[in-house]
């Protein structure tokens, strides 16, 4: 919650210096605090702009100081405004001449809706003039000169919210300069009620705290704190958590504290009077000395804190037995914490009695967001709240506040968090040298993006296309050798920088790829794989001339595509072929070879071949006759793999002619899948057959195809293959 306090010192202006100080206590406003003249309350006041300065004694405070010679320009109404997360809080106050003809009983007066109210002004100067009363600068009432009493009153038998405003009194011949001001604040609700429709019940706001009609929360007077304002602050302190201090020799003497409506203005506890410069009489305490001590067991009454209970007693009147409450204290929290961006688990530790519960401990971010503990534990003397921020980023840097609010009081401790950007190299590492099992790398760790100093560096590496985790080595120098690599393997490399602190590992930098050198001999050259029979394939290669004296041999690996059998054959190095036998007919095999010495050589590329067929080939499929002209036509087809088809025969004859009058066209390259028949007669019907041949024989066509050539002048036609059963 926003804690905004306006200190009016002094509201009655004489020839002394006077000031307004606006303090944002325990939070960081999004926009600057503003202090201005409240023309809503008084339209016809002085127009001069205010000279607002930063209060050097406090981090988030603004101040206006009037020197004695400016006294004539001070009279009027003022405001202070603070904003956080869209919420604006405005506090109002007034200043008037000490030499005014009348003086108000109080600077502000807070009443409940429906209350019977008397707004009173004390006559200070006697004049033979009518007295006049204004509300918000507009005339409302006058008293004839001979009837002006010592106490001039405005009576409101049933105060309503519209009655609220700044009431001023003066003689008719006076002006703003001789006017006395008091502000009436009318709570929108009746006593003890709050809510938009005023039908909720307030909690008790002790020590003259005021129940806020919109939220039901207590606004505590200066010098008291907690949910019900029951807890007295330490001497001369104020604010929601009592962490602001009055720096005067006599504490908060001569400070008028103004808080958000409906509180208004009052002296700090222990003081009374319009100038807050009168101490409470014995037996009285609190703001404006309005509270009476009724200490149960004859305990002493302190004008600042009320009853000072004996050990073992507590409560406003020391009416309850129990361990005396102890204001919580936040411990072991450094003033400055450096954090690496990412996950962050801040800890807030507090003592006090009763010990704070997890609900009573919060963490407030610089933007005003309130965080609650993710984890909580306590010992005999301390409560420890652990918060979790899943992703803290540099914009989260600033003043964070650990806040503890128990029945024994409230305490806040601001601390500074500086969020660092994790380092990341800008460049990929460079490969200086490689062998078949090592690489020399320049890690290129600088320049890097992000924050230093760098605590350690890691070189990460892994083979490309392998689903294994990255391996890493810690490095201290810029040049590093990677050992125990696989030969002829492509690797990727990157560098990760680590800065100090938890979670200091930065993102890995750009990736560099490299391939290790080969090991062993290259594969045989001129490899050729051909079928020999239904159960054998023949692999041949060019003679091998080794560069060293080492013994060598050729290793041939063959595996079936259809079945899961594999065989590796060793062939003496002086041979240039090997017959792969005991194979299955009509099966496809994959074969590769390498030349091995003591070290294994590199594998060749895969070669594939089918063994010869043990059955007649199937008919060519997808037979189409197209591009028909008067003398030619294109025939296309497809054949099935694996039947050792060596040739295709196209047989055609004029329809109706004898069987022996056909023409055979033999296509010996089985990879050809179309052929153009030429020299045909125009306007003639042909019967076309197509066969496939392999080592066993020819395929059996189920039907013939009909082809009719066009007349000489016509354009080509497509024929989907008119089928004629044989």
């Amino acid at each position: 919650a926003m804690d905004l306090i306006l200190i009016n010192s002094l509201p009655l202006v004489s020839d002394a210096e006077t000031s307004l100080t606006c303090i944002a206590s325990g939070w960081r406003p999004h926009e600057p605090i503003t202090i201005g003249r409240d023309f809503e309350a008084l339209m016809n006041q002085h127009q001069d702009p205010l000279e607002v300065t930063q209060d050097v004694t406090r981090e988030w405070a603004k101040k206006v100081v009037w020197k004695r010679e400016k006294a004539s320009k001070i009279n009027g109404a003022y405001f202070c405004e603070g904003r956080v997360r869209g919420e604006a809080i405005r506090i109002r106050t007034m200043k008037m001449r000490q030499q005014a003809s009348f003086l108000p009983a109080t600077l502000t007066m807070t009443v409940d809706k429906g209350d019977n109210v008397n707004i009173s002004f004390k006559k200070v100067l006697i004049k033979e003039e009518d007295a006049v009363i204004y509300k918000n600068g507009s005339f409302i009432h006058s008293v004839p000169r001979h009837e002006v009493p010592d106490i001039l009153e405005v009576h409101l038998p049933h105060a309503q919210p519209q009655d609220a405003g700044v009431y001023s009194a003066r003689y008719i011949g006076g002006n703003l300069f001789t006017s006395a001001f008091t502000r009436l604040i009318v709570r929108r609700c009746e006593a003890q009620k709050w809510g938009p429709e005023c039908n909720h019940l307030c909690t008790a706001c002790m020590n003259n705290g005021v129940c806020h009609e919109d939220t039901g929360e207590c606004i505590c007077p200066p010098g008291f704190m907690g949910r019900t304002c029951e807890k007295a602050c330490e001497l001369h302190t104020f604010g929601r958590t009592c962490k602001e201090r009055c720096s005067g020799q006599e504490g908060c003497k001569s400070y008028v504290f103004c808080l958000p409506d409906p509180y208004g203005c009052s002296c700090a506890t222990g003081w009374k009077g319009l100038q807050c410069n009168e101490a409470c009489h014995p037996g009285f305490y609190g703001p404006d000395c309005k509270l009476r001590c009724s200490c149960n067991n004859g305990e002493m009454c302190d004008r600042f804190q009320g009853c000072l209970c004996s050990p073992g007693w507590q409560g406003l009147q020391c009416e309850r037995e129990g361990i005396p409450r102890m204001t919580p204290k936040i411990v072991d929290l450094p003033d400055h914490i450096e954090v690496n961006s990412g996950k962050f688990n801040p800890i807030c530790k507090a003592s006090g009695w009763p010990l704070p519960t997890n609900e009573e401990m919060t963490l407030v971010k610089p933007d005003g967001t309130v965080l609650h503990p993710k984890d909580f534990n306590h010992t005999d003397h301390f409560s420890v709240a652990i918060f979790t921020i899943h992703r803290i980023l540099p914009p989260d840097s600033g003043v964070w506040v650990c806040s503890v609010n128990t029945v024994a009081g409230m305490v806040e401790k601001p601390f500074n968090i500086s969020v660092k950007v994790l380092p990341k190299p800008l460049n990929a590492p460079n490969v200086i040298d490689t062998g078949h099992n090592f690489a020399v790398i320049n890690i290129s760790s600088e320049p890097y993006f992000g924050d230093g100093p760098i605590k350690s560096k890691k070189l990460l590496y892994k083979p490309v296309n392998h689903y294994e985790a990255w391996q890493h080595i810690q490095v201290t120098n810029e040049i590093v050798t990677l050992n125990y690599l696989e030969p002829r393997t492509e690797y990727e490399l990157c560098v990760q920088l680590v800065r100090r602190g938890e979670g200091g590992e930065g993102h890995p930098g750009p990736v560099r790829r490299f391939t290790t050198a080969s090991i062993g001999l290259p594969p045989p050259r001129g490899l050729n794989l051909l079928p020999k029979s239904q159960t054998t394939l023949n692999l041949t290669w060019q003679p091998i001339f080794p560069s060293s004296e080492d013994d060598f041999y050729v290793e041939v690996e063959r595996r079936s595509v259809q079945k899961s059998d594999q065989q590796n054959i060793k062939v003496p190095g002086n041979l240039t072929s090997v017959l792969l036998n005991n194979l299955h007919p009509r099966e496809q095999y994959v074969v590769r070879a390498r030349v091995n010495t003591k070290a294994q050589g590199e594998w060749s590329e895969d070669l594939t071949a089918w063994t010869l067929s043990d059955i007649l080939p199937p008919q060519p499929e997808n037979i189409k006759i197209s591009n028909i002209t008067h003398s030619s036509a294109v025939i296309s087809w497809t054949i099935l793999d694996g039947y050792s088809i060596s040739s295709i025969t196209i047989r055609y004859k004029v329809q109706g002619k004898n069987e022996d009058q056909h023409v055979d066209v033999k296509i010996k390259n089985a990879t050809i899948t179309q052929y153009q028949l030429k020299g045909l007669e125009p306007e003639t019907a042909y019967q076309v057959d197509i066969f496939a041949e392999n080592n066993i024989g020819s395929s059996n066509p189920a039907f013939s195809h009909e082809l009719v050539t066009l007349p000489e002048s016509q354009a080509p036609a497509d024929l989907g293959g008119g089928k004629m059963l044989l």
Partner: antibody, heavy 117, light 113 residues
Framework: QVQLVQSGGGVVQPGRSLRLSCAAS????????MHWVRQAPGKGLEWVAV????????YYADSVKGRFTISRDNSKNMLQLQMNRLRSEDTAVYYC??????????WGQGTVITVSS | DIQMTQSPDSLAVSLGERATINCKSS????????????LAWYQQKPGQPPNLLMY???TRESGVPDRFSGSGSGTDFTLTISSLQAEDVAVYYC?????????FGQGTRLEIK
């Protein structure tokens, strides 16, 4: 933080009376308004009554007005609900609760009231 | 009295998935003077009293995990659990406190699919 411990539940015949109690410890009981809320078996939550911190103001749900009385004894840190002329529809788990603004922050453990002949 | 209506009556969501519960009031619970929505959310597990999760429609109560979030304004509100955990199985209630008597929604039963 207030802790609330309830007592006084049981089985009662229609038309009879019963008194529920809620004992508070921890924070200053006398500073807080107090509520009663009930929950019929397998049903949702229904607000019953509220009393101001000093006992001066009391409000009731229409369904219990004239039959139930909320009271408190701040010297004993005790909240009570006197239930007269009980009906079968008053069968429920009854909870006492302290508010945080208008939300109910701290709840008693609940006490079961069964109105049955 | 202000009526509160929740939807759906029951909901089954896989662990780790997002769960969304809706609440509609018969009149606006947004107070224009302070721009606050007078709405709270509760979680109730079997055999236990309700537990306050949210107030002012979107302010998380102390100790409530940040996977719970509240949104909406005026008459339409949503409670979202960003990544459902086993311990989130419960009945969830919305409640208005704009006007007395305070009133609750009928509840939404949340289960694991």
């Amino acid at each position: 933080q207030v802790q609330l411990v309830q007592s006084g539940g049981g089985v009662v015949q229609p038309g009879r009376s019963l008194r529920l109690s809620c004992a508070a410890s921890g924070a200053t009981f006398s500073n807080y308004a107090m509520h009663w809320v009930r929950q019929a078996p397998g049903k949702g939550l229904e607000w019953v009554a509220v009393i101001s911190y000093d006992g001066e103001n009391k409000y009731y749900a229409d369904s219990v007005k004239g039959r139930f009385t909320i009271s408190r004894d701040n010297s004993k840190n005790m909240l009570q609900l006197q239930m007269n002329r009980l009906r079968s529809e008053d069968t429920a788990v009854y909870y006492c609760a302290t508010p945080k603004g208008g939300a109910l922050e701290i709840w008693g453990q609940g006490t079961v009231i069964t109105v049955s002949s | 009295d202000i009526q509160m209506t929740q939807s759906p009556d029951s909901l089954a969501v896989s662990l780790g998935e997002r769960a969304t519960i809706n609440c509609k009031s018969s009149q606006s619970v947004l107070y224009s003077s302070n721009n606050k929505n007078y709405l709270a959310w509760y979680q109730q597990k079997p055999g236990q009293p309700p537990n306050l999760l949210m107030y002012w429609a979107s302010t998380r109560e102390s100790g409530v995990p940040d996977r719970f979030s509240g949104s909406g304004s005026g008459t339409d509100f949503t409670l979202t659990i960003s990544s459902l955990q086993a311990e989130d199985v419960a009945v969830y209630y919305c409640q208005q406190y704009y006007s007395a008597p305070i009133t609750f929604g009928q509840g939404t039963r949340l289960e694991i699919k």
